[in-house]
């Protein structure tokens, strides 16, 4: 049979090298030789290339090399397959030098901060050493910071009497590390060199670019002083380099600001204790280049009523992520704080804690939590400067087994019943949130049978049992992830009761 | 031959934020190509917003400073804009437009949808 | 950012004029840039790129010339569908910024 004819012809003029065009070859059953037809200086000369390789891949590929090719030039390509049973032809292709020109990379051989000019990098390279003189050159810089994954982009053209070959990029983050990478193409061309070298390079440090500031109310002591204990974090979006000296902190009941105090620390944390009004309190971070904005949070009066709107809260599991939801009843309301926490027994030292804005859910990657805790998680709403009354959940990142069962015992043993109790697993053992309990009980050498009660019951009555017959029970505890049974406690039901 | 069409809600309150998605049909949005947003005031005035490429890089204009966010759907064939804190000074016609990688102009536009900004 | 100023704001004209609209851009732009036309209710039409490259299927009457930071549309003979609004763009460097139009009516 024929050979297939040849399709999807593409040509590439690797600038100053040579010209490569590919093509899809078809199915071929017997051995194919392709022969390349081109005509050159415009319409003026015409010359051919044959595959001389053997195997398939690179039989759909030929190429031309210099000093047969200039530019600007314009060429017609024709695919030529020929086997012992003849020739077939492709259709005729039409190529302009320019616009399938395709340069090697430019090379960056510096990326540095300028002195005095915030937030910018200064990226400077080599242009291309084969490159069209003639032709202004277009340019695509991607620049990344180094904890990213995502590129961000940014296009220009340098023209052909730019002798400067550099480019500001403004509008980036202080303090933070960049990966740049640039590539180039002929003004006229389709085709883009390939990526430069990735190239390293830093913005300035500034002032603390601001804080988040939040507060953790205590009861009021017996002097009537209130613990309140103040927490503070970088700004979302602060460079992840960011370097504090210190922090000033200012703060004075609502009613006299000539009351005010003020202390510096070095910590993220501080315990103030206030009177029953309500307070300000005003924060700054600073470094050596200046201060940071500043923060301030309201305190409310001892008495002071908080407004209540979230309706329903809840929590599940999706693709890796905690997520909570709210419903809120008040429509003003778009800021909301998130608070969360382990639930153990002690008092808690680690409270974490974010502020969500224009939503009412908020999402926290399942790694960023330890798996088979409890945590409590609060949601506060946040109107101006009031804080609303928050709603909690309790919430696993990932539920497991019970690593034990419930303590189980046996009481009000009759003729034909029982009462199975058991205990609450402790918070540390449970892994999940226990879904439900199932009672299993089976008499000597007979028919095991179960029943399932949900998490809030902890003791059930067998009925319908056998009189003076030995009986085997366990209980189990089941979160989402699987049941773990206690241990098995033996019985045996009388054989006659008092009222016989 | 590619064509495109934009949807969303067509008011959107002060504060809140403003999501518009843009359908792609008779083209992959992963084979080449950056995939624009533009928009166009009350007064005639065009304004460039940003991309997301072919590969998924994105591009912005930086008079939105960091308001503007490009995202994509490839199991949909479609891209999104994500405009937050939206005052009046937003509402427009919003465009969206592919252009060829090493051409900076745009053959092929949407019909747009107009957003209006309001309480 | 590089601006780009359209003259005039406003164009009256009769059919079979030949017509000039200018454009101007703050920075040597060499031949980085591109003509729309928008009619009322419709989306911008591409022209013109590359400051005098034709695009197929626009009417031969529209032609563009100059090159760094002075630009000229001109219409060869207008017909009264070319009203519209007429935009140029910076295709040279980013941010792409579009010029504020110049309006063609027919007198």
């Known amino acids: 049979a024929l050979p297939a004819k040849p399709e999807n012809i593409s040509c590439v003029y690797y600038y100053r090298k040579n010209l490569t065009c590919t093509w899809s070859p078809g199915k071929e059953t017997s051995y194919t030789q392709y022969t390349v037809k081109r005509t050159y200086a415009f319409g003026e000369k015409h010359d051919n290339c044959t595959t001389n390789s053997s195997t398939s891949e690179n039989r759909a590929s030929c190429s031309f090399f210099l000093p047969r090719i200039t530019i600007p030039d314009n060429y017609t390509i024709e695919v030529e397959a020929e086997n012992g049973d003849g020739v077939i032809k492709s259709h005729m292709t039409y190529w302009r030098l320019e616009n399938i020109a395709k340069t090697e990379p430019p090379k960056i051989f510096r990326v540095k901060p300028v002195l005095g000019i915030k937030r910018m990098i200064q990226i400077e390279w080599i242009k291309p050493e084969l490159a069209p003189v003639s032709s202004d050159l277009k340019y695509t810089l991607r620049f990344r910071t180094v904890n990213s994954t995502s590129w961000m982009e940014v296009n220009f053209a340098k023209n052909r009497k730019d002798k400067n070959q550099t480019y500001n990029l403004t509008g980036l983050q202080p303090f933070t590390e960049y990966v740049i990478a640039l590539r180039c193409a002929v003004k006229e061309s389709k085709f883009w060199s390939d990526w430069s070298q990735e190239k390293m390079g830093m913005t300035e440090e500034e002032a603390p670019c601001g804080l988040e500031l939040w507060r953790v109310l205590k009861p009021a002591e017996a002097d009537g002083r209130r613990p309140v204990r103040l927490l503070w974090k970088k700004a979302r979006g602060a460079p992840v380099l960011e370097k504090t000296l210190g922090y000033n902190i200012w703060y004075y009941p609502e009613s006299n600001t000539n009351l005010t105090e003020t202390m510096n620390t070095t910590n993220q944390q501080l315990e103030l204790h206030l009177g029953g009004e309500s307070f300000w309190v005003s924060m700054i971070s600073y470094n050596s280049l200046g201060k940071s904005p500043v923060a301030t949070l309201r305190i409310p009066a001892i008495q002071e009523k908080s407004f209540q709107c979230i309706e329903v809260m809840q929590a599940c599991v999706a693709e890796d992520q905690l997520v909570v939801k709210w419903q809120s009843s008040a429509l003003d309301v778009n800021t909301w704080m998130i608070e969360w926490f382990p639930d153990v027994d002690s008092e808690p030292t680690t409270l974490s804690w974010e502020s969500v804005s224009q939503a009412t859910n908020w999402t926290i990657q399942q790694d960023k939590l330890k798996p088979f805790w409890c945590y409590n998680i609060s949601v506060y709403p946040m109107l101006h400067d009031k804080v609303g009354e928050p709603y909690s959940i309790q919430a696993y990142a990932k539920e497991g087994v019970p690593s034990e069962g419930p303590e189980t015992k046996v009481e009000n043993i009759g003729v034909k019943t029982v009462t199975i109790t058991w205990k609450e697993i402790p918070k540390s053992e449970r892994k999940g949130i226990i879904c439900n309990y199932t009672i299993f009980y089976q008499a000597e050498g007979g028919k095991g049978f179960s029943k399932t009660v949900n998490s809030s019951i902890l003791q059930y009555g067998l009925e319908s049992l056998k009189r003076k017959t030995s009986y085997i029970v366990q209980v189990m505890a089941s979160t989402s992830a699987g049941g773990t049974n206690g241990t098995s406690i033996n019985f045996k039901t009388l054989s006659f009761s008092v009222f016989e | 031959d590619v064509q495109l069409r934009e949807s969303g809600p067509g008011l959107v309150k002060p504060s809140q934020s403003l999501s518009l998605t843009c359908t792609v049909t008779?083209?992959?949005?992963?084979?080449?190509?950056?995939w624009n947003w533009i928009r166009q005031f009350p007064g005639n005035k065009l304004e460039w917003m940003g991309y997301?490429?072919?590969?998924?890089?994105?591009s912005y204009n930086p008079s939105l400073k960091s308001r503007v966010s490009i995202t994509r759907d490839t199991s949909k064939n479609q891209f999104f804009l994500q405009l937050n804190s939206v005052t009046t000074e937003d509402t427009a016609t919003y465009y969206c437009?592919?252009?060829?990688?090493?051409?900076?102009?745009?053959?092929?536009w949407g019909a747009g949808t107009t957003v209006t900004v309001s309480s | 950012d590089i601006v780009m100023t359209q003259s005039p704001a406003t164009l009256s004209v009769t059919p079979g004029d030949r017509v000039s609209l200018s454009c101007r851009a703050s920075?040597?732009?060499?031949?980085?840039l591109h003509w729309y036309q928008q009619k009322s209710h419709e989306s911008p039409r591409l022209l013109i790129k590359?400051?005098?490259q034709s695009i197929s299927g626009i009417p031969s009457r529209f032609s563009g010339s100059g090159s760094g930071s002075d630009f000229t549309l001109s219409i060869n003979s207008v017909e009264p569908e070319d009203v519209g609004v007429y935009y140029c763009?910076?295709?040279?460097?980013?941010?792409?910024?579009f010029g504020g139009g110049t309006k063609l009516e027919i007198k």
């Open positions: 763009q910076n295709g040279h460097s980013f941010p792409w910024t």
């Open positions: 008779g083209y992959s949005i992963t084979s080449d190509y950056a």
């Open positions: 997301i490429s072919y590969s998924g890089s994105t």
């Open positions: 590359y400051a005098s």
């Open positions: 920075h040597d732009i060499s031949d980085f």
């Open positions: 437009a592919p252009m060829i990688t090493t051409d900076w102009f745009f053959d092929v």
